[in-house]
Amino acid sequence: HSDPARRGELSVCDSISEWVTAADKKTAVDMSGGTVTVLEKVPVSKGQLKQYFYETKCNPMGYTKEGCRGIDKRHWNSQCRTTQSYVRALTMDSKKRIGWRFIRIDTSCVCTLTIKRGR
Amino acid sequence: HSDPARRGELSVCDSISEWVTAADKKTAVDMSGGTVTVLEKVPVSKGQLKQYFYETKCNPMGYTKEGCRGIDKRHWNSQCRTTQSYVRALTMDSKKRIGWRFIRIDTSCVCTLTIKRGR
C-alpha cells in the first residue's frame, strides 16, 4: 500500500512489519483468552500450505519508543502501543483438539494519551 | 483486550471495529493489487466454515475526523488514516481460479503528520 513517507508524511508512532511463520510463532492467544498451538501447515485440496501471518508492532528501536511524535506535551503524556486484531488460524488447544480459531496477532502501533494533571 | 479508556487513556485517533462476512465484503485486493472475489465459505474436514474478518477503521463519526487528538498544532497538520494489513482468505481471481491468497483488510486507525510550513 502507498507509503506515507513518500507523501511527506510521518507517523505519530514508528512501526515495523514482518511475515511470521507458525513455526516462529508456536503459540497464540485465542478469543477466549486461552493459549493455543499454531499449526505449521494447513491441509488444502492440493496438499499443504505453510501457515504464516503479517504482523505489525511498535518499533522498539524507533524514535517514538519514548513517546509519540508530534504530541502537545503541555497537556499529554503519550505512549506508542502495539494493538492486536484477530485472524483465523488452524490451531490445537490444550486438550489436543485441532480446529480453526481466531487468534490475536499484532497488527498496528497506535498512540495512546493520558492527560497531565497539574504540573 | 484491555480497554485503554478504562486506564484513563485516550486514543489519538478514534476507531471502530466490526466483524465482516465474506458476503458483506464480496471483493478484496490481493497482494499483487488485483481484485479477487472472497468466497463465502471455506471447506474444512467437518463441512464448511463461514469466512469472515475482524476489521478496524477510523470512526467517521468520531471527534478525530477533523484531525488527530492531542497533536501540537503549532508544528503539525494531522489526519487519522485507516491502515491495512494482510490476512489469508479463500478467494477466486478474475480467471475463476480458486485459491488461498493474502488480501488486504482494514486493521487500524493511525495518525499521520505533515509539517506546517510557517503559521
Epitope: D72, R74, H75, I115, K116 | L10, G70, K73, R74
Partner: antibody, heavy 118, light 108 residues
Framework: EVQLLESGGGLVPPGGSLRLSCAAS????????MGWVRQAPGKGLEWVSA????????YYADSAKGRFTISRDNSKNTLYLQMNSLRAEDTAVYYC???????????WGQGTTVTVSS | EIVMTQSPAVLSVSPGDRATLSCRAS??????LAWYQQKPGQPPRLLIY???TRATGIPARFSGSGSGTDFTLTISSLQSEDFAVYYC??????????FGGGTKVEIK
C-alpha cells in the same frame, strides 16, 4: 481583527447557576487554547480555568474545581463556562482570553459581570 | 502553587519620569513571565511576554527584564495614557496560572 465577546453574566442568588459564553472571531479558534480570568470588584486578576484547543485537557483553579466546567464548541467558535453552586465570592467580572501556546493571554474580551447576591 | 508578589502596591510618578515596577516569584519561573496593563473599566492588555519581549503594537518605552525569580517592568518616560494598574503573570508552572496583586501607577 481578533475579537472575543463574552455574554451570559447577570444577577444570581447564592447556590444558583450561570453559563457564560465567549464568541471568538478573527482567528482560527480551534488552533488555540482558551481560558477564563475573573476580577472581583476593586481586586486583582484571578485565573479561573483553561481548555486545550481540542476540548479535552481542562484545568481549574482550586476555587473553581467541582463547581465550574469549561467547554468549547469549535464548530461555533465559542467558549463556555458553566458555573454551578455560585457563592458571593464568585462575584466578579469574568474575562475570556485567548491563550498563547505558552499560556500567557494575548487577547482579552471586554468581560461580563456576574453578581451573586440574595 | 507559585506566588507572585508585586511591589510597590502604588507608585506615584510624574509624567515624563521613569517608572520601575517589580515582580517576584516564590520560585524560579525561568523567563515565563508576562506583564499586563489595565485601565479602569477596560480588560487587561498584554504588554510583555517571555519577560522581555514586547507584544505587537506596544511602544518601545515599555521594557521588561529579569529571569528566575526577579523581574522588572520599566516605563522609560511616562505618558498620560500609561497611568493604570500593571499585573505580572507566571506561566512556567501551571495549573494554576498565577498573577501578582498589581501595581497602580498614579500621577504624582
Amino acid at each position: 481583527e481578533v475579537q472575543l465577546l463574552e455574554s451570559g453574566g447577570g444577577l444570581v442568588p447564592p447556590g444558583g447557576s450561570l453559563r457564560l459564553s465567549c464568541a471568538a472571531s478573527g482567528f482560527i479558534f480551534d488552533d488555540y487554547d482558551m481560558g477564563w480570568v475573573r476580577q472581583a470588584p476593586g481586586k486583582g486578576l484571578e485565573w479561573v480555568s483553561a481548555i486545550d484547543h481540542g476540548g479535552y485537557a481542562r484545568y481549574y483553579a482550586d476555587s473553581a474545581k467541582g463547581r465550574f466546567t469549561i467547554s468549547r464548541d469549535n464548530s461555533k467558535n465559542t467558549l463556555y463556562l458553566q458555573m454551578n453552586s455560585l457563592r458571593a465570592e464568585d462575584t466578579a467580572v469574568y474575562y475570556c482570553a485567548k491563550l498563547d501556546y505558552y499560556y500567557y493571554m494575548d487577547v482579552w474580551g471586554q468581560g461580563t459581570t456576574v453578581t451573586v447576591s440574595s | 502553587e507559585i506566588v507572585m508578589t508585586q511591589s510597590p502596591a502604588v507608585l506615584s510618578v510624574s509624567p515624563g519620569d521613569r517608572a520601575t515596577l517589580s515582580c517576584r516569584a516564590s520560585q524560579s519561573v525561568d523567563i515565563k513571565l508576562a506583564w499586563y496593563q489595565q485601565k479602569p473599566g477596560q480588560p487587561p492588555r498584554l504588554l510583555i511576554y517571555d519577560a522581555s519581549t514586547r507584544a505587537t503594537g506596544i511602544p518601545a518605552r515599555f521594557s521588561g527584564s529579569g529571569s528566575g525569580t526577579d523581574f522588572t517592568l520599566t516605563i522609560s518616560s511616562l505618558q498620560s495614557e500609561d497611568f493604570a494598574v500593571y499585573y505580572c503573570q507566571q506561566y512556567d508552572d501551571w495549573p494554576p496560572l498565577t498573577f501578582g496583586g498589581g501595581t497602580k501607577v498614579e500621577i504624582k
